[in-house]
């Protein structure tokens, strides 16, 4: 009879074991275990009748199609075999064991005691067949195995071979190299590769196989396993395989598809090809006169580009347009995209006008082309070139006039400062106690007229100022504040300010330059109570032309000490010239007591301590700060007065040989101007040099060297 066994392990014994087995008996045990296992059988006891080739009693172990062993007897002899310590392993998951005894037994035989168990098959070690083994990596586990692939590969649906994803390769460059995956290593199995070469219309793709060409083939059938096909439009070239590479292929197309197929077996190294774009040839090019073509080649093909440039000092001229370079291109029809342009000498054209300056041409015929030279100069003696620049400009290769120091920037003609067109006399008679100024003696002197129409009725007053540049007037802050609210500092509106320059006689303003104000800038810390920081600036609407009667005064160096005691300075103004006129008389007579002709006086600087003391001794809260200095005579008789406010107290600077504004007429009193021991108080300008430059928007270095020259 037959016994079916399906357990993973078990015991098999001869009938009647451990007693002797009966005669004429046959039992078959069929053992089945799961796939991925095999069966291991071994005997713990074996005692059967001996016979030649086990003809009488035996135990036979077999699979479906193969006898694995036949055992009988008690000991192994030449003709019979006992299992002993031997282990029988089934090749698969099935094993059949048959016990048979014949009709007679000469003795009592106890039979056998056998054990079986399912054991794991290590498929990774035992699979020799390429059709079944893993392509790259094999992983065994109890009862089975699985395959995996190297980086960049994908496991095929057969769960065994490794393929690559290579169906999305686009080539758009004009030249390139395409290879089978992993070249020159064996290409992957079970793969469908697609390579697209897509170039601009007008190009034609040429293919050339190189180096190794090794694709699995067949001796009789053309390329049944692995192959390359080349698709050009509707036409298909190939299949190609084997070890002989195809001849170079001229596709005559700008679009080519390369298909590469591999099956699930074989170890071949693959292929490599290079492709190159070919286009129509364009005619030979001649560079223009005074120019060159880059790159310089014997032949030019479709899409080649050349850059036409000119020698230094020449510009490319194309359709009357000047440019640095011009590019032309070889077209698909074999013609150039444009004619070669010409090279024209650079022309810097007429040089820019220099404000307050002149231009002279150094080159004959007033040429303005490359390497021509011009010279700028300033309108002497009223303007001087900043930083003593040479003023020489050369027409550069870029088409701009260039100076070695300033580059393409024009020079600056700065107003000469502190140099009256007529020299100031060294001796001046004792505004009060002053004398008439000759025209041009104080060319910086400005008359500032303010008409404040913001109040009803309108307020009108005037003061003086000093020209610092063609656009800026320096004055006292109190001149430019609204007069009707004595405790507040409200700047007058710029619309209410008129400035007269080059004025000599206030009755005759015809020869003077009058200008309105663009900006009124009071010092932010001006104190109405004690007149500290009594300094302000007026920016003129338009720069004034300089001349013998209109020239700036120089600013001092930054010196907290200010002018030294006893130094003599000059002040000019149209203020009250008669010391015997009282304020009441001024009020009643309107403006008739003002000087018609500009007056000036020479005054010594008073030691600071002496001036402070003279004001502290008075009743009233007078404060002579470090931002002020005093000038005048102990005995009185000469002084600045009402209407002179904001005017410049100038001192001749021996070092620079120029007149420098050291003070601004600020305040004095309470006694009448020119009284004994009533010194005039002046704003110390040297404390404000930085502030002045900052407001004027000029770096201090611009004018400093002129003063120190």
């Amino acid at each position: 009879h037959t016994v079916e066994l399906n357990n993973m392990f078990g015991q098999i014994q001869s009938p009647g074991y451990p007693d002797s087995y009966p005669s004429d008996s046959e039992v078959t045990w069929n053992i089945t275990v799961p796939d991925g296992f095999r069966i291991k059988l071994y005997f713990m006891h074996f005692n059967l009748e001996s016979s030649y080739l086990c003809e009488y009693d035996y135990v036979k172990v077999e699979t479906e199609d193969q006898v694995l062993a036949t055992f009988c007897g008690r000991e192994t002899t030449d003709t019979e075999q006992t299992p002993g310590q031997e282990v029988v392993l089934s090749p698969g998951s099935f094993m059949s064991i048959t016990f048979r005894s014949d009709f007679s037994n000469e003795e009592r035989f106890t039979g056998f005691d056998a054990h079986y168990m399912a054991v794991d098959v290590d498929e990774c070690k035992e699979r020799e067949d390429e059709e079944l083994s893993c392509d790259h990596y094999c992983h065994n586990y109890i009862g089975g195995y699985y395959c995996s692939c190297r980086f960049g590969y994908i496991l095929h649906t057969d769960n065994r071979t490794c393929r690559v994803e290579c169906s999305d390769n686009l080539f758009t460059q004009r030249t390139g190299v395409i290879t089978s995956p992993d070249f020159p290593n064996p290409y992957p199995k079970s793969s469908e590769c697609l390579y697209t070469i897509e170039l601009e219309e007008g190009f034609m793709v040429n293919l050339q196989f190189e180096d190794i060409f090794d694709i699995e083939d067949h001796p009789e059938v053309p390329c049944p396993y692995d192959y390359i096909k080349i698709k050009v439009g509707p036409k298909v070239l190939g299949p190609f395989c084997g070890e002989k590479a195809p001849e170079p292929i001229s596709t005559q197309s700008h679009s080519v598809l390369i298909l590469f197929h591999s099956d699930n077996s074989g170890e071949n190294r693959g292929w490599r090809l290079s492709y190159r774009a070919a286009g129509n040839e364009c005619p030979e090019l001649q560079p223009p006169v005074h120019g060159k073509i880059e790159p310089s080649q014997a032949k030019y093909f479709f899409k080649d580009q050349v850059l036409v440039s000119c020698d230094t000092g020449y510009k490319v001229l194309k359709d009357n347009v000047e440019m640095d370079t011009f590019q032309i291109e070889c077209l698909k029809d074999g013609t150039w995209s444009n004619k070669i342009p010409t090279c024209k000498i650079v022309d810097c054209r007429a040089p820019g006008e220099l404000e307050h300056g002149l231009i002279t041409f150094s080159t004959r015929n007033n040429l303005t082309t490359y390497k021509s030279e011009i010279k700028y100069s300033c309108q002497e003696p009223y303007y001087k070139m900043l930083n003593n620049n040479t003023g020489i400009y050369t027409c550069s290769a870029q088409g701009v006039w260039m100076n070695k120091v300033l580059g393409r920037s024009l020079p600056t003609c700065l107003p000469e400062c502190g140099q009256p067109s007529r020299s100031l006399p060294s001796l001046v008679k004792r505004i009060i106690g002053g004398r008439n100024a000759e025209p041009g003696l104080f060319p910086w002197q400005a008359l500032i007229v303010v008409e404040d129409t913001s109040r009803v009725p309108n307020d009108k007053w005037f003061g003086s100022g000093a020209l610092l540049s063609a656009s800026w007037i320096l004055t006292a802050a109190h001149v430019l504040r609204s007069q009707r609210r004595d405790t507040t500092v409200i700047p007058v509106s710029k619309e209410h300010v008129t400035v007269y320059l080059g004025l000599h006689d206030v009755r005759d303003k015809s020869g003077a330059v009058n200008s309105s104000a663009a900006r009124v800038v009071l010092h932010p810390d001006f104190n109405i109570q004690n007149y500290n920081h009594d300094i302000a600036l007026v920016q003129l609407q338009e720069p004034v032309p300089l001349g013998p009667h209109v020239m700036p005064v120089c600013l001092p160096r930054l010196e907290p000490e200010g002018p030294a005691p006893h130094m003599l300075g000059l002040v000019a103004g149209w203020g009250i010239s008669n010391p015997n006129v009282t304020v009441d008389e001024i009020i009643s007579s309107g403006t008739r007591t003002l000087s018609d002709v500009l007056q000036y006086v020479k005054l010594p600087v008073v030691p600071h301590a002496e001036c402070k003391t003279s004001y502290e001794s008075r009743s009233g809260n007078y404060s002579v700060t470090e931002n002020m200095f005093c000038a005048g005579y102990y005995e009185g008789g000469k002084d600045t007065c009402l209407g002179d406010s904001g005017g410049a107290f100038v001192i001749f600077d021996d070092l620079s040989q120029r007149w420098v504004v050291q003070g601004l007429v600020s305040w004095g009193g309470p006694e009448e101007c020119g009284s004994k021991q009533v010194y005039g108080v002046y704003t110390k300008v040297s404390n404000y040099v930085d502030w002045v430059w900052e407001q004027m928007g000029l770096p201090q270095s611009v004018v400093e060297p002129q003063v120190e020259r």
Partner: antibody, heavy 113, light 112 residues
Framework: QVQLVQSGAEVKKPGASVKVSCKAS????????IEWVRQAPGQGLEWIGE????????NYNEKFKGRATFTADSSTSTAYMELSSLRSEDTAVYYC??????WGQGTLVTVSS | DIVMTQSPDSLAVSLGERATINCKSS????????????LAWYQQKPGQPPKLLIY???TRESGVPDRFSGSGSGTDFTLTISSLQAEDVAVYYC????????FGQGTKVEIK
């Protein structure tokens, strides 16, 4: 001719604010100062402050600093005075005037609980 | 602040007679730069806003009868009505605008 027309009378509770308007005509509004003056019933005149509409510059009587605010709308040629934290002693006729010469008709502000 | 003191507080004058009002300031109102005394005189009738009569201490506003005149400088100022008319009955105020403006306390003018 130059004219200043003020808004109508107001009754306010203590602690509230009042805003009086003054519409100018007949001259360039932005170029002249507008002053504000008040007069308590049966009393004299008291200067509050001023504004220059073109620039927004202001001056205040120290007594009203922080309580009075002046503004001006150039597009409508109107000046405004706002007085906050009102108390009963702020009851008065409030006048606007163009610098020194032309006065508005006055606005009576009554502060009462 | 500049204090303005008017005198007398009230004044009764016969029609056609001269009326004089004084105004004293606690500091000078003369602005040296403009050479002006910043003092104005106003007339206020009941229920009306004040009306400008004199500015800069002595300049008559246009349209003001010439019987009104102003004088003085520095700290002492005077308003004179040379021949009082019935329509001149009012309260008169002086105002300084040299500084943050202040008014005098007013002088009431009546007919005797």
């Amino acid at each position: 001719q130059v004219q200043l027309v003020q808004s109508g009378a107001e009754v306010k509770k203590p602690g509230a604010s009042v805003k009086v308007s003054c519409k100018a005509s007949g001259y360039t509004f932005t170029g002249k100062w507008i002053e504000w003056v008040r007069q308590a019933p049966g009393q004299g005149l008291e200067w509050i402050g001023e504004i220059l509409p073109g620039t927004g510059s202001t001056n205040y009587n120290e007594k009203f600093k922080g309580r009075a605010t002046f503004t001006a709308d150039s597009s409508t040629s109107t000046a405004y005075m706002e007085l906050s934290s009102l108390r009963s002693e702020d009851t008065a006729v409030y006048y606007c005037l163009r610098s020194e010469d032309v006065w508005g008709q006055g606005t009576l502000v009554t502060v009462s609980s | 602040d500049i204090v303005m003191t008017q005198s007398p507080d009230s004044l009764a004058v016969s029609l056609g007679e001269r009326a004089t009002i004084n105004c004293k300031s606690s500091q000078s109102l003369l602005q040296s730069r403009t050479r002006k005394n910043y003092l104005a005189w106003y007339q206020q009738k009941p229920g009306q806003p004040p009306k400008l009569l004199i500015y800069w201490a002595s300049t008559r506003e246009s349209g003001v009868p010439d019987r009104f005149s102003g004088s003085g400088s520095g700290t002492d100022f005077t308003l004179t009505i040379s021949s009082l008319q019935a329509e001149d009955v009012a309260v008169y105020y002086c105002k300084q605008s040299y500084n943050i403006p202040t008014f005098g306390q007013g002088t009431k003018v009546e007919i005797k």
